[in-house]
């Protein structure tokens, strides 16, 4: 069974700054990957970026830079200030439309006791199947 | 597949402001995320800009900030291109596409004339 | 901003010709990540908008026929049309879409003899 895991992290230098790091573990190719934030995509939460292995990478405030770091993970910076600034209980979630095995979404967020600067670990938050 | 269907023709004078639509139907969620594409007669294209449908963010080409506004009613699938202070050099075929330029609108003629 | 460059201009073939078209980026258009090329080539024909080709550099778009074939990494890419029709006859435009702004080239006329 695919499996897709998110890891969040409060950059210790700039605590309006968060990483965001999500993962497909699974067989099949990956056809596009949505990260949001509030929520899963299309259930009252806002789209953050769009991934496209070949078209390319769309990406709206307070995101800073969206990159794939490997075929099957990617990454996400986020920085902000005021209204559009995350904070330590936002949810992010990280939507992996693939072929053949569907869309599977896992949301997470920064973990309560975690410091600055250290990386909440990778969780495959529970899996949605959203197909 | 989607279709985005844009508003018709206009002709306005110097000085005046513009707003322009798209329509987009479609069935998957990225279909609702429009770019906007200038081209002049003659000339290659330019991207102004797009717009994200949930929650009205937007991207523009420095080029274009403060020429565009882009906006977006989510509940009717329509995004929405404002140009102000309109000269001779904005007159051209206008364009939304979706967020891939997968889809194109069929373009938009602004002729601005005294 | 990323410069792109096409050359030639424009093109005179005859039907049935093989062309070969190309693109120049001012900064490289490979995505180290996943190893893909962002770049798209689009077809105008006259009193149309754009239609998008080629995406990724070399990945045909749905319904494309196959005489039209993109190739090319980092910031050299060509399209190459193996056999000329007469419905061909456009304008062929590169875009990098690596990051913004997405910046489209000048553009290659082909022109049928």
């Known amino acids: 069974t695919p499996e897709v895991w998110v890891q969040v992290r409060m950059e210790a230098t700039e605590l309006s700054s968060f990483t965001i790091r999500c993962g497909f573990l699974g067989s099949g190719s990956i056809s596009l990957v949505t990260v949001s934030w509030g929520g899963p995509n299309g259930a009252g939460g806002t789209t953050l970026a769009v991934l496209h292995p070949e078209r390319g990478i769309r990406q709206w405030a307070p995101a800073r830079q969206a990159r794939w770091e490997t075929q099957s993970s990617i990454s996400l910076i986020l920085e902000g200030s005021g209204a559009s600034s995350p904070c330590a209980n936002t949810t992010f979630c990280c939507k992996f439309a693939s072929f053949p095995e569907g869309s599977w979404e896992a949301c997470g967020s920064l973990p309560p006791s975690s410091d600055p600067g250290l990386s909440a670990p990778p969780t495959p938050a529970p899996i949605l199947r959203a197909d | 597949e989607v279709q985005l269907q844009q508003s018709g023709p206009e002709v306005v004078k110097p000085g005046a402001s513009v707003k322009i639509s798209c329509k987009a139907s479609?069935?998957?969620?990225?279909?609702?995320?429009i770019n906007w594409v200038k081209q002049r007669h003659g000339k290659s294209l330019e991207w102004i800009g797009d717009?994200?449908?949930?929650?009205?963010?937007?991207n523009y080409n420095q080029k274009f900030k403060g020429k565009a506004t882009l906006t977006v009613d989510k509940s009717s699938g329509t995004a929405f291109m404002g140009l102000r202070s309109l000269t001779s050099e904005d007159s051209a075929v206008y364009y939304c596409a979706t967020l891939f330029f997968d889809s194109w609108g069929q373009g938009t003629t602004l002729t601005v004339s005294s | 901003d990323i410069v792109m460059t096409q050359s030639p201009s424009s093109l005179n073939v005859s039907a049935g010709e093989k062309v070969t078209m190309s693109c120049k980026s001012s900064?490289?258009?490979?995505?180290?990540?996943?190893?893909?090329?962002?770049l798209a080539w689009y077809q105008q024909k006259p009193g149309q908008p754009p239609k998008l080709l080629i995406y990724?550099?070399?990945t045909r778009e749905s319904g494309v026929p196959d005489r039209f074939t993109g190739s090319g990494s980092g910031t050299d890419f060509t399209l190459t049309i193996s056999s000329v029709q007469a419905e061909d006859l456009a304008l062929y435009y590169c875009?990098?879409?690596?990051?913004?702004?997405?910046?489209f080239g000048g553009g290659t006329k082909l022109e049928i003899k």
């Open positions: 900064q490289s258009l490979l995505n180290s990540g996943n190893q893909k090329n962002y």
């Open positions: 479609g069935n998957t969620f990225t279909d609702y995320f």
């Open positions: 717009v994200n449908p949930d929650n009205g963010g937007t």
């Open positions: 875009q990098n879409a690596h990051s913004s702004p997405y910046t």
């Open positions: 990724g550099a070399s």
